[in-house]
Interface confidence: medium
């Protein structure tokens, strides 16, 4: 029967026996940073060419003994996930592998430094198709492997690392707090967390999801024909190379944003038992589980957005965390979130010429985190339209004058300590959805956007009684681009995505006693683009397209507002 | 790639013609800073990894690097250029010192200083 | 144990190339610089650079630098010299030796056997 | 380049005679300086590492000193297994020069 993990990364509507995509890769490059590797391995044989790169530190022990096995053992378990024969994922996908880890496993930052400028200078000499790396590797936060990570992503080439085994924040290290990396967490059969002895997979927001990593077979460097179970997030991580092999031999032009959207959209999400997490953690880490598309052929489609949090501001009264989009991707809302519920909204702001979204700490609060939502948006221009706070009882409301362009999200940032001695603004008026709508004591923010087809609708969803959650989520079509909470009183803790769902958090109920203040609405922007369809439709042909624009005319845009309970 | 050295006569005039004071402050008060693994025994005390600013040519990272191993040997400090970077990040990586960080970030041209650390399979 | 095995003696004409192998065993090879040094007969030694077979980085001695090529195989641990446009007084017997660094000491603790190179017309 | 100066070039001693080399550096190398002993047909052996650290395995009759320019390999009680030729070698700057030699002979 096949393996338990080959089963899970296949899409459900496919039997994974039957399920072959074809080319599995073929037109990829993945490098692998390892150990040795046994290269006339079955499982890997003619798939591997081991380059003559070797920058590994001496073993530690006197009575260390080196036996060839055990030397391979990591990278060649690792090359057949990646692309073996029977156990692989990506059965096409060539591979190159470079030794920067030693006998122990072990290796140092500067080696693979000059492992990943070996890489880029092989690129240079001679150019090939789409490049993977898989660094299955881990050591403390690194400045410097993060920025050679960096520049070696904006040359085009997809990184993908483990998370870490150390059960704790993947921050803490490198390459995997690497923003442009993708870092990989391990889940087991049941999609739990994978535990490792006393530790376990890493977590928190530098994980851009999990994969399986627990109980993996593939090649064992014991025998040319052998197999072993080998478990950890650079088993994790390995699929993940494979997966993305597929996508960029199905699609060779992906860019790395695209790539991460796609691996992020196509995944397993919500199965995975968030209770193994800290607490502290849960929120920020992805509840992805990585999958194959359902078919070779990307969802182009698809407007595609994913949410980026902040590192936390930390506790002073002025301090302020700021969340990043990656390169070629759109910020199209802003958001904020503090435990204590102290805190001082958030705005999208330009900085060296691409927008970020700052979120700002209030003086007794514990710190705040900043959520951008990052979106794939070809051809967008956006801005940002601010208004300062009103003098008005009404609220500060502020709407997408330009001609053409739609709200994406709405934000709202304020001076005063306590919004919650301040009253909340009254009903949005109706038949002006395209607006954003804040307390009067706030200056709102709104990210107005244009691009071919794009349209996008509000969806309310609001709790009159007090509730530590409210969720409102877009429809199958529509991609949730703003979330954000009504009234902007102090007891809502603040306002994320998670997928396609806008979680608007509130203080704990017995805290906030069940007055009308209690009231919250959570509010979502939902979009889509009609021009992606199109620009899809018009390159699958009428085969897998088809239907698209009679599925678009029954979704006429309707503005969606289920008032509950204001006061 | 061949280490594009210069003459050793230039090594020794800069040994003899540069100030006793420590190396040139760099460009416009902006100060390098030095990095080194938050996990202590991870670390690699010894070895580091002097990156510089990116728009930096790979004849002014070898001379840096020259400039750094003059200054040193004054100062009775021995060091090795152990590779210099090109392609991805302007720099050089080094052998020499602890007692040395102090000189090399005020180098001209140095952006940071990270001290080697481990890296381990997972 | 630690040792360094050289390639056997060569007899060159003057214009030729000679490359010397220098075989590491017992350690691990990318984790030392590897050095040149020659003697001719009945002189002193002579420093012609070395190589960090973990990077390929390079540094020669100036009368060199025009001449000599160092290169290395990190799968059979193997460095290499390669001296080109041999003169007569290139005859010398060629050693590489393994530099040991530690905090502000370095030296060289292994040495080959040495290679014995004759350039004669 | 930094020239080592050794002296003398050759000298002829007794078993359990005390010698001493000397080595002078053109300029100041600090206590970047290795000794090495060399027998005929033979590769060098290191004896003595940053002026005056005695290499591992190296008989305690074997000692180093000095710094700066002037440095001195001393054998306390000459042993019939030493006679061979000594070289000093200067590690600070490259090129990393050795000395001429000195050929300690039987007398």
């Known amino acids: 029967s096949i393996p338990w993990n080959l089963e899970r990364i296949t899409p459900p509507r496919y039997r994974a026996d039957e399920y072959q995509p074809p080319d599995g890769g073929s037109l990829v490059e993945v490098y692998l940073l390892d150990t040795s590797i046994q290269s006339d391995h079955r499982e890997i044989e003619g798939r591997v060419m081991v380059t003559d790169f070797e920058n590994v530190p001496e073993e530690d022990g006197t009575r260390f003994h080196r036996q060839a096995s055990k030397c391979d053992s990591h990278g060649t378990h690792l090359a057949g996930v990646v692309s073996g024969r029977d156990a692989g994922v990506a059965k096409g996908a060539s591979m190159r592998s470079l030794r920067v880890l030693n006998c122990q496993g072990k290796g140092t930052v500067s080696g693979t430094l000059i492992g990943l400028e070996f890489i880029r200078k092989s690129q240079l000499v001679q150019p090939v198709g789409p490049l993977v790396v898989l660094l299955p590797l881990a050591g403390g936060y690194s400045r410097v492997l993060n920025a050679a990570c960096q520049r070696l992503a904006r040359a085009g080439v997809v990184l993908v690392t483990a998370a870490g085994n150390f059960r704790d924040d993947a921050c803490l290290y490198s390459p995997a707090s690497a923003p442009e990396v993708i870092t990989v967490g391990a889940t087991n059969a049941q999609d739990q967390p994978v535990t490792l002895g006393t530790l376990g997979t890493n977590f928190g927001r530098c994980v851009d999801l999990f994969a399986p990593g627990e109980d993996i077979i593939g090649a064992s460097s014991d025998c040319s024909t052998c197999f072993v179970s080998q478990s950890g997030t650079s088993q994790a991580a390995a699929h993940v190379a494979g997966i993305a092999a597929m996508m960029l031999s199905a699609e060779p032009e992906l860019t790395l944003a695209e790539l991460r959207q796609r691996l992020i959209h196509f995944s397993a999400k919500d199965v995975i038992n968030e209770a193994w997490f800290p607490e502290d953690q849960r929120v920020l880490t992805p509840n992805l589980v990585a999958a194959l598309p359902p078919s070779t052929h990307g969802a182009g489609w698809q407007l595609f957005c994913r949410t980026v949090w902040s590192a936390h501001s930390g506790p002073t009264r002025m301090a302020t965390a700021v969340a990043r989009c990656a390169p070629d991707e759109e910020l199209l809302s802003c958001s904020s979130f503090s435990r204590s519920g102290k805190r001082r909204g958030e705005r999208m702001e330009a900085q060296g010429g691409k927008l970020v979204c700052r979120a700002h700490n209030a003086f007794g609060g514990e710190g705040v985190y900043a959520i951008a939502r990052c979106c794939l948006l070809p051809q967008a221009n956006c801005s940002v339209h601010t208004a300062p706070p009103a003098e008005a009882s009404m609220g500060t409301r502020v709407h997408c004058h330009q001609q053409g362009h739609v709200l994406t999200g709405c934000s709202s940032h304020w001076e005063v300590e306590d919004l919650g001695t301040h009253k909340p603004p009254v009903l949005r008026p109706r038949g002006q959805p395209n607006q954003c709508v804040g307390h009067r004591e706030a200056s709102i923010h709104a990210s107005c956007c244009h691009a071919p087809g794009l349209e996008c609708k509000v969806k309310e969803h609001g709790i009159p009684a007090p509730q530590e959650q409210v969720t409102v989520a877009c429809e199958e079509g529509w991609t949730l681009t703003g979330c954000s909470a009504l009234p902007g009183t102090s007891h809502v803790l603040g306002a994320y995505a998670v997928d396609n769902t806008c979680v608007v958090r509130s203080r704990d109920v017995s805290t906030t006693g069940s007055t009308s203040e209690g009231a919250v609405t959570a509010v979502a922007i939902c979009c889509r683009s009609r021009h992606l369809a199109q620009a899809s439709q018009e390159l699958q042909g009428s085969t897998s397209g088809s239907g698209l624009n009679d599925i678009f005319e029954a979704q006429k845009i309707e503005w969606h507002e289920h008032h509950h309970h204001h006061h | 790639q061949e280490d594009e050295d210069g003459d050793y006569e230039e090594l020794v005039l800069a040994l003899r013609s540069e100030e006793d004071g420590l190396a040139e402050a760099p460009e416009h008060g902006t100060t390098a800073t030095f990095h080194r693994c938050a996990k202590d025994p991870w670390r690699l005390p010894g070895t580091y990894v002097v990156v510089l600013k990116e728009e930096t040519h790979l004849s002014q990272s070898e001379r840096t690097a020259r400039r750094l191993q003059a200054q040193a040997a004054r100062r009775g400090y021995l060091t090795k250029i152990l590779h210099v970077f090109h392609g991805l990040l302007p720099g050089f990586l080094v052998k020499m010192s602890g007692d040395l960080l102090e000189l090399a970030l005020k180098l001209p041209h140095v952006d940071y200083i990270e001290e080697d650390s481990s890296v381990f399979a997972q | 144990q630690v040792q360094l095995v050289q390639s056997g003696a060569e007899v060159k004409k003057p214009g030729a190339s000679v490359k010397v192998s220098c075989k590491a065993s017992?350690?691990?090879?990318?984790?030392?610089?590897i050095h040149w040094v020659r003697q001719a007969p009945g002189q002193g030694l002579e420093w012609m650079g070395y190589i960090n077979p973990s990077s390929t980085y390079t540094k020669f001695n100036q009368k060199f630098k025009d001449r000599v090529t160092m290169t290395r195989d990190t799968s059979i641990s193997t460095a290499y010299m390669e001296l080109s446009r041999l003169r007569s007084d290139d005859t010398a017997v060629y050693y590489c030796?393994?530099?040991?660094?530690?905090?502000?000491?370095?030296?060289?603790?292994?040495w080959g056997q040495g290679t014995t190179v004759t350039v004669s017309s | 380049d930094i020239v080592m100066t050794q002296s003398p070039s050759s000298l002829s001693a007794s078993v359990g005679d005390r010698v001493t080399i000397t080595c002078k550096a053109s300029?100041?190398?600090?206590?970047?300086v290795a000794w090495y002993q060399q027998k005929p047909g033979k590769s060098p052996k290191l004896l003595i590492y940053?002026?005056?650290n005695r290499y591992t395995g190296v008989p305690s009759r074997f000692s180093g000193s000095g710094s700066g320019t002037d440095f001195t390999l001393t054998i306390s009680s000459l042993q019939p297994e030493d006679f061979a030729t000594y070289f000093c070698q200067q590690l600070s700057s490259s090129p990393e020069t050795f000395g001429g030699g000195t050929k300690v002979e039987i007398k």
């Open positions: 940053s002026a005056s």
């Open positions: 017992g350690y691990t090879f990318t984790g030392y610089t």
């Open positions: 300029q100041n190398v600090y206590t970047a």
């Open positions: 030796a393994r530099e040991r660094i530690y905090s502000n000491y370095w030296f060289f603790d292994v």
